[in-house]
Structures are given as structure tokens and as C-alpha cells.
């Protein structure tokens, strides 16, 4: 049986600042159980940058719908890109905990690069 | 089309075991996680244990005494319980899984169900 | 454990009347809420998932609607084989998966 695989196709995404950056990711399968969460950077100081389950992320959108059956595309849009928004992103996907969930398996990362807007 | 079959209940004794087994046809069955919710006589539906791949989930009723596990080269899905207690006397029906993009699981396939009565 | 609550407990319908259900959980579930119908000797069917969206092939009398706390499960116009028991569960926080402790539809 193939163990899931996260998928992240692009090493690197330029964008414009001012312009919405997407990000891709997708699983190969819809097991094991658990969440899948999008954080810029690595290790103990990576920052959240969405989950669907708890918090609020005004500036990310879901290129997949919501509500759609056995999903495996977990592409997100960020909007309004600045510089600060620069970095690597990672998509990583848990497995389901009681009571926490736990990191089972990350993408190699999206190196996103803001450029200057143009005038 | 989606079946699943459920089997192996039956009249067993307080302290007692049985195993149930699910056939699963009509999907891929190895890529969706599987299910057991069980229903006592004249009641509502319990939750009993869930397995993805190698993760299993347990309600805390069943915990330590019941084992899901799951074959996907036989498309079967098994519940072993053991230390059996009239509590547990109910229809156990199997599931397959299905979730919304980034949720949860709900259950959009169920079997037929198999009694299991524990009494002496 | 997120508890659902259902109400009524028993709900006497005239076939062709509108019948609603209610389901109340304890914390907020955003829209992580199923509907199932059961009849007598039956397994339970999916009607609704993400509290709004009707499985494929269940009639569009049924549609669900609510978020966060509380869901209604709505029968516009209620047919001889919609007398049955109907449960809510919720997939929002688990384990452990819970369901609501049903509502019966009787013919009035």
C-alpha cells in the first residue's frame, strides 16, 4: 500500500506585490485521517498561515470549494502580497490525535518571492 | 455500486468474543477510512471505532477491549471484541467514510448491519 | 465530547405537511454536521452533509440549513416513505464522533 505523499509541484512562485499568490498542494490519498494546515517556514517557530478548523485567516481563500467530496487538492490563494509575505511555505498534513493531532507528513515547501509593483 | 456486507454476530456470553467482518465492494477501498457504529435495541446510534490507515480511533466504551483492523488485499474490514458485556448487545453496522475538503469524516455508505447479543 | 441534542424527540406530521427537525450541539460545529434517515429494520442513509448539502439522489424536499450551534433539518412537504427516525452527527471534533438521540417522524 503507498503511504500518502504531499505534493507541493512548485519549488518556487514570484509574484507582484498587491497581486494574490497560489499555492499548490495536493495529497495522493485521503488517509490517514487528519487535518492538513498550510505554516511559512519551518521548525518550532513556523508561522500558521491557514487551517480551516480554528482561526481566522482573512487574506487566505481555498482554491478548492469546502464543501467538495474527498478532496485532495489543498491549493491555497493568499491576497495582497507584500514584501513581508516572503518566504517558504510548507503543507503539511496530520494525522488525527486525541486530544492533539500529529505532524505526519510535510510538502518540500513553495519558496514564494514578492517583487516590486510594477508602476 | 457501493456494498458492504457485514458478518459474524451472534449470541455470545458476558466475558466472551467475536469478530466481525465487513466486505467492501463497488469502491477503492483502500483509500477511504472505514467505520463501525453499533445501535442497541430500540435506541440511537453509537459511534464504535474508525480506521484510516494505520490509525485507529476507539469511543472510550470499547476502548482496550475492542480492535478494528483492516485488509485491503480482501476488502475487509474487522472489528474483534472481546470481553464482551450485555452493553454491548446492539446491531453493529460498518461504514465507509467520506469528508468534505478540509473537514471531518461523515459516513455516506452503510451495511445491513449484524446482531450481536451478549448474554448468558 | 460535543453533545447533540435533538428536538422534538417525536414529531406528528400529516403526509403533505412541513415537517422541522432541530439539532443543538453543545460547542460550536461551524458546518461539520450530517443528517441520516432511518427506517424500521434498516440501516441509516445520508441525506445532508456540511449542514446544507443534499447527497446524491436524496429528493429536494429535504435541505438542511444552520451553522455554529444550531441546525434544522427541513421536510417541505412530507411523503409516506419520509416517516422514519432522523439523526444529526457531528465530524467537527472527534473522537469521539457523536450523534444527536433522534427524532421520530410519525404520520399524525
Known amino acids: 500500500e503507498d503511504e500518502l505523499q504531499v505534493i507541493q509541484p512548485e519549488k518556487s512562485v514570484s509574484v507582484a506585490a498587491g497581486e494574490s499568490a497560489t499555492l499548490r498542494c495536493a495529497m495522493t490519498s485521503l488517509i490517514p485521517v487528519g487535518p492538513i494546515m498550510w505554516f511559512r517556514g519551518a521548525g518550532a517557530g513556523r508561522e500558521l498561515i491557514y487551517n480551516q478548523k480554528e482561526g481566522h485567516f482573512p487574506r487566505v481563500t481555498t482554491v478548492s470549494e469546502l464543501t467538495k467530496r474527498n478532496n485532495l487538492d489543498f491549493s491555497i490563494s493568499i491576497s495582497n502580497i507584500t514584501p513581508a509575505d516572503a518566504g517558504t511555505y510548507y503543507c503539511v498534513k496530520f494525522r488525527k490525535g486525541s486530544p492533539d493531532d500529529v505532524e505526519f507528513k510535510s510538502g518540500a515547501g513553495t519558496e514564494l518571492s514578492v517583487r516590486a509593483k510594477p508602476s | 455500486e457501493v456494498q458492504l456486507l457485514e458478518s459474524g454476530g451472534g449470541v455470545v456470553q458476558p466475558g466472551g468474543s467475536l469478530r466481525l467482518s465487513c466486505a467492501a465492494s463497488?469502491?477503492?477501498?483502500?483509500?477511504?477510512?472505514m467505520t463501525w457504529v453499533r445501535q442497541a435495541p430500540g435506541k440511537g446510534l453509537e459511534w464504535v471505532s474508525t480506521i484510516g490507515s494505520g490509525d485507529t480511533y476507539y469511543a472510550d466504551s470499547v476502548k482496550g477491549r475492542f480492535t478494528i483492523s483492516r485488509d485491503n488485499s480482501k476488502n475487509t474490514l474487522y472489528l474483534q471484541m472481546n470481553s464482551l458485556r450485555a452493553e454491548d448487545t446492539a446491531v453493529y453496522y460498518c461504514a465507509k467514510d467520506s469528508t468534505v475538503s478540509w473537514s471531518g469524516d461523515f459516513f455516506d455508505y452503510w451495511g445491513q448491519g449484524t446482531l450481536v447479543t451478549v448474554s448468558s | 465530547e460535543i453533545v447533540l441534542t435533538q428536538s422534538p424527540a417525536t414529531l406528528s406530521v400529516s403526509p403533505g405537511e412541513r415537517a422541522t427537525l432541530s439539532c443543538r450541539a453543545s460547542?460550536?460545529?461551524?458546518?461539520?454536521l450530517a443528517w441520516y434517515q432511518q427506517k424500521p429494520g434498516q440501516a441509516p442513509r445520508l441525506l445532508i452533509y456540511?449542514?446544507?448539502i443534499r447527497e446524491t439522489g436524496i429528493p429536494a424536499r429535504f435541505s438542511g440549513s444552520g451553522s455554529g450551534t444550531e441546525f434544522t433539518l427541513t421536510i417541505s412537504s412530507l411523503q409516506s416513505e419520509d416517516f422514519a427516525v432522523y439523526y444529526c452527527q457531528q465530524y467537527y471534533d472527534w473522537p469521539p464522533f457523536t450523534f444527536g438521540g433522534g427524532t421520530k417522524v410519525e404520520i399524525k
Open positions: 463497488g469502491f477503492s477501498f483502500s483509500n477511504f477510512a
Open positions: 456540511a449542514a446544507r
Open positions: 460547542q460550536n460545529v461551524k458546518n461539520d
